[in-house]
């Protein structure tokens, strides 16, 4: 027999199967060419001295055998006298140390066994009742498959699946997917219903992010606030990355993880927009204001577990940059403008109350006035800052108030509401002898001193009731005594506190009549 | 669903050269090959040859071996096969048919394993 064709003769060994373990197995027939056809298989055990023989059976019962000697693939044409346009059975005989031994057989028509291609192009990954979801095209002309997947983690070796028979224009298969590891899966495809057809090569990796993507641990800190009212936020700590599998290091498409960072400004709820989300490597400029900071991990399954923290507003205050002056029609509030055409926020609360009962006022965009100034004005019926106590002023700034990053703060500062002057009078004033000519003059603090930096000074005003002379006497705002000295025994005085704001002049506490008395010696 | 349309038939002088084109469109993704047929009044219809479209190998009629060739042109949804005859002979007039299969297990030279046909092209080789 010529050694390119099928030998129609009985082998050159003897026919009995050993039974044994070893031997040849998984073989493999198929088409490369337009006239050339290809088998391989498997061997089992030492392989020295070991000669292959490919057997075949065509459908008309006449059997043939190649001598492949110690290759274990073989190639032969169209014209080696094994039918390829009819189904016939192959199997491998082996012979080695004076025994046979012989693969399962394959029954197939060698024409249409052609090797599939993979998946090719775009595979679409998806999740689906906690499993992954891959999805792709069939490629053309090869409809009708086997598939199978393989997959691994960065620290477990490859684990093969099954996919199920595929018949349509459109492949997919369901796999597992890992809570907390990415994957690296591959994809390979053969005929369906073609037994021995060969399997295409393995696919090009997909890589796949973890179910849950990894929960930020990240740090910031915020910078003091800036003469331009503005402070930066920093992150003190990048985001670890994730560990991939070998195939997915270097370029790995579908794994990324990308953190966002949200904020959320707390203080002056009346502007547009109280939430923006920016990339994580794009640190933002802050008001004063306070907020809240969410950073939040996301991979091709959607959002995982955020991480928030809560910035506090910053509360260093301007006890000047605010005037205030109170009329008859109501209040208007003076600061020192920012620039043209901003937006001014202007937000107040009752102080010792929480943060929640906030009220703010959003201005028109204002230029400075003359003086360079930016007004905000409120009538009493308003009922802004109308109660007579305490409140803490901030005012903002924005070019652009629909931007949340570009918001400034302009100034902080106290504000006592309602009729300051009448309500900052000093009550419980007393008197007491202190020496000879001096009295000692006492009140209680007034509700003034509860606002920082509203207070400017006390004023005691006493009144010589035979001269009718007058003299007042500052006290610092922290104080709440004065002695008066130089009086007269026998004189009868009256004293008068009142308390003063840099623009009020405060209203005198009720009189308070009393004398020195005349000292006689014994 | 596959249609097929052939065109390109003529006349044309013995020893002469033609290319007759059959162009798919519909699903063709789903078809595995497609294969050229002739036939002449009062007898069955002839295989001459077939490609298998994945791959582009092909199989010849023995009687058409080393004179006609079969390529095909795949794009998204359409394919175009070729049959490039040269060295015509008087024997070669028929009208010539394209077929496509969607089955993996058929043999070339059997028409009930195609599930598509064109409506034929005719092809005169005069002396």
């Known amino acids: 027999c010529r050694t390119s064709e099928c030998c129609f003769q009985d082998p050159p060994y003897p026919d009995a199967d050993s039974g044994s373990a070893s031997g040849p197995r998984d073989l493999r027939c198929y088409r490369i060419s337009s006239d050339r056809y290809e088998c391989s298989w498997q061997y089992e055990g030492p392989t020295a001295g070991v000669s292959h023989f490919l057997r075949c059976c065509l459908s008309s019962g006449r059997c043939c055998y190649f001598a492949a000697g110690s290759a274990t693939r073989l190639q032969f044409s169209d014209q080696a006298g094994v039918s390829v346009l009819y189904t016939v059975t192959l199997w491998v005989e082996s012979w080695a140390r004076n025994q046979t031994e012989k693969s399962p057989e394959v029954t197939l028509q060698l024409y249409n066994s052609v090797k599939y291609e993979p998946p090719l192009g775009d595979i679409k990954v998806s999740k689906l009742a906690g499993q992954l979801r891959m999805e792709w095209e069939t490629p053309d002309n090869q409809v009708g498959a086997e598939v199978q997947f393989r997959h691994r983690t960065p620290s477990s070796p490859w684990k093969l699946g099954d996919c199920g028979p595929q018949d349509d224009d459109t492949e997919s298969c369901l796999c597992p997917l890992e809570m907390n590891v990415a994957q690296e899966f591959q994809l390979r495809r053969r005929q369906l219903g073609s037994q021995g057809s060969s399997w295409s090569k393995w696919s090009s990796p997909v890589c796949v992010p973890p179910e849950n993507p990894p929960q930020p641990q990240v740090r910031f800190s915020v910078e003091q606030l800036g003469q331009d009212g503005r402070r930066r936020l920093t992150l003190k700590e990048q985001p670890t990355q994730l560990e991939l599998p070998e195939g997915c290091q270097g370029l790995a498409p579908g794994t990324e993880v990308t953190y966002r960072l949200q904020l959320h400004m707390l203080s002056c709820p009346c502007k547009a927009k109280a939430t923006r989300t920016l990339h994580l490597g794009k640190m933002p400029y802050l008001s004063g204001a306070a907020y809240n900071v969410a950073v939040i991990s996301s991979n091709q399954f959607g959002p995982g577990l955020n991480q928030t923290w809560h910035i506090p507003a910053d509360t260093h205050t301007e006890p000047v940059a605010l005037n205030i002056s109170v009329g008859t029609n109501g209040t208007t509030m003076y600061w020192p403008a920012r620039a043209q055409s901003m937006t001014y926020c202007i937000e107040w609360q009752p102080v010792g109350q929480d943060g929640g009962l906030a009220t703010c006022s959003l201005t028109a965009p204002q230029d400075p006035d003359p003086a360079g100034m930016a007004t905000y004005s409120w009538s009493r019926e308003s009922g802004a800052m109308g109660q007579e106590k305490c409140y803490y002023i901030t005012i903002f700034a924005s070019a652009h108030p629909e931007k949340l990053t570009l918001w400034s703060t302009v100034l902080s500062t106290y504000h006592f509401g309602g009729n300051a002057s009448a309500a900052g009078t000093p009550h419980h004033v007393s008197v007491k002898n202190h020496s000879l000519d001096s009295v000692s003059v006492d009140w209680a603090p007034s509700l003034l001193s509860t606002c920082p930096g509203v207070l400017k000074e006390y004023v005691v005003r006493c009144r010589d009731e035979d001269s009718k002379q007058v003299s007042e006497h500052p006290v610092q705002p922290t104080e709440t005594q004065v002695t008066l000295s130089g009086l007269r025994a026998g004189v009868a005085y009256t004293v008068q506190v009142r308390a003063d704001t840099a623009w009020l002049r405060g209203v005198w506490s009720q009189p308070q009549r009393f004398s020195i008395e005349v000292q006689v010696s014994d | 669903e596959v249609q097929l349309v052939e065109s390109g038939g003529g006349l044309v002088q013995t020893g002469g050269s033609l290319r007759l084109s059959c162009a798919a469109s519909?699903?063709?993704?789903?078809?595995?090959?497609m294969g050229w047929f002739r036939q002449t009044p009062g007898k069955e219809r002839e295989f001459v040859g077939e490609?298998?479209?994945?791959?582009?190998?092909?199989?010849?009629a023995d009687s058409v071996k080393g004179r006609f060739t079969i390529s095909r042109v795949n794009a998204k949804n359409t394919i175009t096969m070729y049959l490039q005859m040269n060295s015509l002979k008087s024997e070669d007039t028929a009208v010539y048919y394209c077929?496509?299969?969607?089955?993996?297990?058929?043999?070339?030279?059997?028409?009930?394993?195609?599930?598509?046909w064109g409506q034929g092209t005719l092809v005169t080789v005069s002396s």
């Open positions: 519909g699903r063709t993704p789903r078809l595995v090959a």
């Open positions: 490609i298998i479209l994945s791959k582009g190998f092909t199989y010849y």
């Open positions: 077929a496509g299969r969607q089955n993996w297990s058929g043999s070339p030279a059997r028409t009930n394993e195609y599930e598509y």
